[in-house]
Amino acid sequence: GPDAVSTPVTCCYNVVKQKIHVRKLKSYRRITSSQCPREAVIFRTILDKEICADPKEKWVKNSINHLDKTSQTFILEPSCLG
């Protein structure tokens, strides 16, 4: 899951393997920092849990498209951008 290596950088070292239903997601943010081993998406669930996901996965792309289109995603201060 998300792991703060040194404030304010948040990186994803592992990504979720199983698909999460879009109805369980309420927002996302992009991780692109060069201090992180990989680019990633962090989803926030309706239960306020943060989950790392692989942005290349089709379900992840579909989920962020859905969140953008339905404006469910609110602007989260990106904790790490490249």
Partner: antibody, heavy 117, light 107 residues
Framework: EVQLQQSGAELVKAGASVKLSCPAS????????MHWVKQRPEQGLEWIGR????????KFDPKFQGKATITADTSSNTAYLQLSSLTSEDTAVYYC??????????WGQGTTLTVSS | DIQMTQSSSSFSVSLGDRVTITCKAT??????LAWYQQKPGSAPRLLIS???SLETGVPSRFSGSGSGKDYTLSITSLQTEDVATYYC?????????FGGGTKLEIK
């Protein structure tokens, strides 16, 4: 630190082909998408296409289909752009860039391609 | 394809000015907009992604706003080092497309 190294310049004859390289350091190209962007002299930026180095899947702007081929070698962590049947219209700076989300946060310094007749 | 239009190709500005550069898409791009700065002889530099998110290391005088089809890059107090060409780019759908660029020149 992420770095995308590109050779400075290439001079090639019209009708020939050229293969431009973009070796990456500070990242594993398998984890991202590698893109190529064209900029003609005194003009704007045009996205050519991208590759997913993990599986070789490519996506192009239709206007570059047939002109451009994008490949990647994960063992050398390098992306390539091949341009065929070169004309003066291909004279430009070609940039490689990384970005899994469709925007480009790290860029190479660009290779200037000059097509001579 | 989604077309991106930057209304002005060049701007004559004074140091210390507030500068606003606009960008319009031919369809809704759902905030999937990036802004780049390019100086002569250099590669573009990403300033903003997701319409509003400032990249690390970019001065806070830069900001992005907008939604739907219409987006804006603002520079609150123009500095010498901000004289450059600025491009918007949509990343809602491939082929990803750039605006034509807006060049800032000192009066």
């Amino acid at each position: 630190e992420v770095q995308l190294q590109q050779s400075g310049a290439e001079l090639v004859k019209a009708g020939a082909s050229v293969k431009l390289s973009c070796p990456a350091s500070g990242l594993n190209i398998k984890d991202t998408y590698m893109h190529w962007v064209k900029q003609r002299p005194e003009q704007g930026l045009e996205w050519i296409g991208r590759i997913d180095p993990a599986n070789g899947n490519t996506k192009f702007d239709p206007k570059f289909q047939g002109k451009a081929t994008i490949t990647a070698d994960t063992s050398s962590n390098t992306a390539y752009l091949q341009l065929s049947s070169l004309t003066s219209e291909d004279t430009a700076v070609y940039y490689c860039a990384r970005g899994v989300f469709g925007f480009f946060d790290y860029w190479g310094q660009g290779t200037t391609l000059t097509v001579s007749s | 394809d989604i077309q991106m239009t930057q209304s002005s190709s060049s701007f004559s500005v004074s140091l210390g000015d507030r500068v606003t550069i606009t960008c319009k898409a031919t369809e809704d791009i759902y905030n999937r907009l990036a802004w780049y700065q390019q100086k002569p002889g250099s590669a573009p530099r990403l300033l903003i992604s997701g319409a509003t998110s400032l990249e690390t290391g970019v001065p806070s005088r830069f900001s992005g706003s907008g939604s739907g089809k219409d987006y804006t890059l603002s520079i609150t107090s123009l500095q010498t080092e901000d004289v450059a060409t600025y491009y918007c780019q949509q990343f809602w759908s491939a082929p990803y497309t750039f605006g034509g660029g807006t060049k800032l020149e000192i009066k």
